[in-house]
């Protein structure tokens, strides 16, 4: 898995809804991989990590000040759905299959 | 300033090109506002930080298991272009009004 | 080497048409905006017009003591630049310099060619 | 339009002596944290030349004697020590706002 001296990258997270209280209201999957973004935004920034502008600069700003400015954050930059059955409001289980932004596609420093 | 138990918040970053090394291209100006984004992205996620349904997801079960899962990131959510002077091949100096993603103007947890 | 050569001028009558033409090289012309500065006899320097750039439907701007009379065009497949000179007045004697450069700054000039109305 | 004004309009200086010229706007050419200011030097019979660019970068190819300074309405050009290749005019010019203007031009002879 990817520690703190580890680049950015996407790592499972499996999330169970019963954990986080979501299971009031879905039914189903009871749990589901989220992924989650981890690691260090690391000079020099990869291609891979798709760095924005802001992103570069605030790394070359950290190298050359590390105490007063922090390094580029690991964090999704873009996100898939799942679907899942829940309950509407009357109570009648109803599949949504685009539930959109639940789970990490990419991962990226920002 | 935000410090680590601030919320998620933008705050000022004074960048001067020379101190990354950037003064051999860009002619002026000589600094910008770059902000940064500072702070933490603590239970519950309010508003203004824009949260996505992962980093809810991500906030409550780094809730339940702080020790397995970080808490979402304090990230710039949307960039603004500046305009900068920079000489072209020719070594023409060029003014291009939109040299865009170099400053925050929005930050979220993600 | 960077090179821009102005048509021969000359003189024209009160009223009168000329058309000056700028052969460049030793650039990217396509890539700069092109320009007429002008210098009246003995007198200080006065921009004409420029022409932008494909990118920018190729507009023009002149100033305000030739818009209805001069314009200016451009052939990118030739490198050149024009200057139609339409309804010409005495003040408008002097030399005439085809620059080339940026949205910022003129960078390159041309030896300049002399316009002179006079009946 | 933006108005330039330099001074003096002319100006004569010993060889190897300092040489001061200035420029003034009638409104701001700062702008994007960027001064619209470029100077030319033009000597006799032959087009202007760029010589300080953005207040105060040298052109290409500019002798190390030539500077730039100011921001806002108020521009210097200076000449640490006149050389005698130096006798010209100088011009100032703004490019902020179409048109772009130049300033009248100041005369710059030996003494």
């Known amino acids: 898995s990817a520690g703190a001296g580890s680049h950015c990258q996407k790592t499972s997270l499996r999330v169970n809804f019963e954990d986080i209280g979501w299971d009031s209201w879905i039914i189903a999957p009871k749990e589901y991989e989220a992924y989650e973004c981890k690691g260090g935004c690391f000079f020099p920034l990869a291609d891979d990590v798709t760095p924005t502008k802001h992103a570069i600069v605030q790394t070359l700003v950290h190298l050359k000040f590390p105490t007063k400015v922090g390094k580029a954050c690991c964090v999704p930059t873009k996100l898939s759905p799942i679907s899942v059955l829940y309950k509407d409001d009357m109570g009648v289980p109803t599949l949504k299959y685009h539930y959109e932004g639940m789970s990490v596609a990419e991962c990226g420093c920002r | 300033s935000a410090g680590a138990g601030s919320h998620c918040q933008k705050t000022s970053l004074r960048v001067n090109f020379e101190d990354i090394g950037w003064d051999s291209w860009i002619i002026a100006p000589k600094e910008y506002e770059a902000y940064e984004c500072k702070g933490g992205c603590f239970f519950p996620l309010a508003d203004d930080v824009t949260p996505t349904k992962h980093a809810i997801v991500q906030t409550l079960v780094h809730l339940k298991f702080p020790t397995k899962v970080g808490k979402a990131c304090c990230v710039p959510t949307k960039l603004s272009p500046i305009s900068v002077l920079y000489k072209d091949d020719m070594g023409v100096p060029t003014l291009k009004y939109h040299y865009e993603g170099m400053s925050v103007a929005e930050c979220g947890c993600r | 080497e960077v090179q821009l050569v102005e048509s021969r001028g000359g003189l024209v009558q009160p009223g009168g048409s000329m058309r000056l033409s700028c052969a460049a090289s030793?650039?990217?012309?396509?890539?700069?905006?092109m320009n007429w500065v002008r210098q009246a006899p003995g007198k200080g320097l006065e921009w004409v017009a420029h022409?932008?750039?494909?990118?920018?439907?190729?507009?023009?701007h002149y100033a305000e003591s030739v818009r209805g009379r001069f314009t200016i065009s451009r052939d990118d497949s030739k490198n050149s630049v024009y200057l139609q000179m339409n309804s010409l007045k005495t003040e408008d004697t002097g030399v005439y310099y085809c620059?080339?450069?940026?949205?910022?700054?003129?960078?390159?000039w041309g030896q300049g060619t002399l316009v002179t109305v006079s009946s | 339009d933006i108005v330039m004004t330099q001074s003096p309009d002319s100006l004569a200086v010993s060889l190897g002596e300092r040489a001061t010229i200035n420029c003034r706007a009638s409104?701001?050419?700062?702008?994007?944290?960027?001064?619209?200011m470029n100077w030319f030097q033009q000597k006799p019979g032959q087009p202007p030349k760029l010589l300080i660019y953005?207040?105060?970068n040298q052109g290409s190819g500019v002798p190390d004697r030539f500077s730039g300074s100011g921001s806002g309405t108020d521009f210097t050009l200076t000449i640490s020590s006149l050389q005698a290749e130096d006798v010209a005019v100088y011009f100032c010019?703004?490019?902020?706002?179409?048109?772009?203007?130049f300033g009248q031009g100041t005369k710059l002879e030996i003494k």
């Open positions: 953005a207040a105060s």
């Open positions: 010019q703004q490019s902020k706002e179409v048109p772009w203007t």
């Open positions: 030793g650039f990217t012309f396509s890539n700069y905006w």
């Open positions: 409104e701001s050419v700062d702008n994007y944290g960027i001064s619209f």
């Open positions: 620059t080339g450069g940026s949205n910022y700054v003129f960078a390159f």
């Open positions: 022409i932008r750039l494909k990118s920018d439907n190729y507009a023009t």
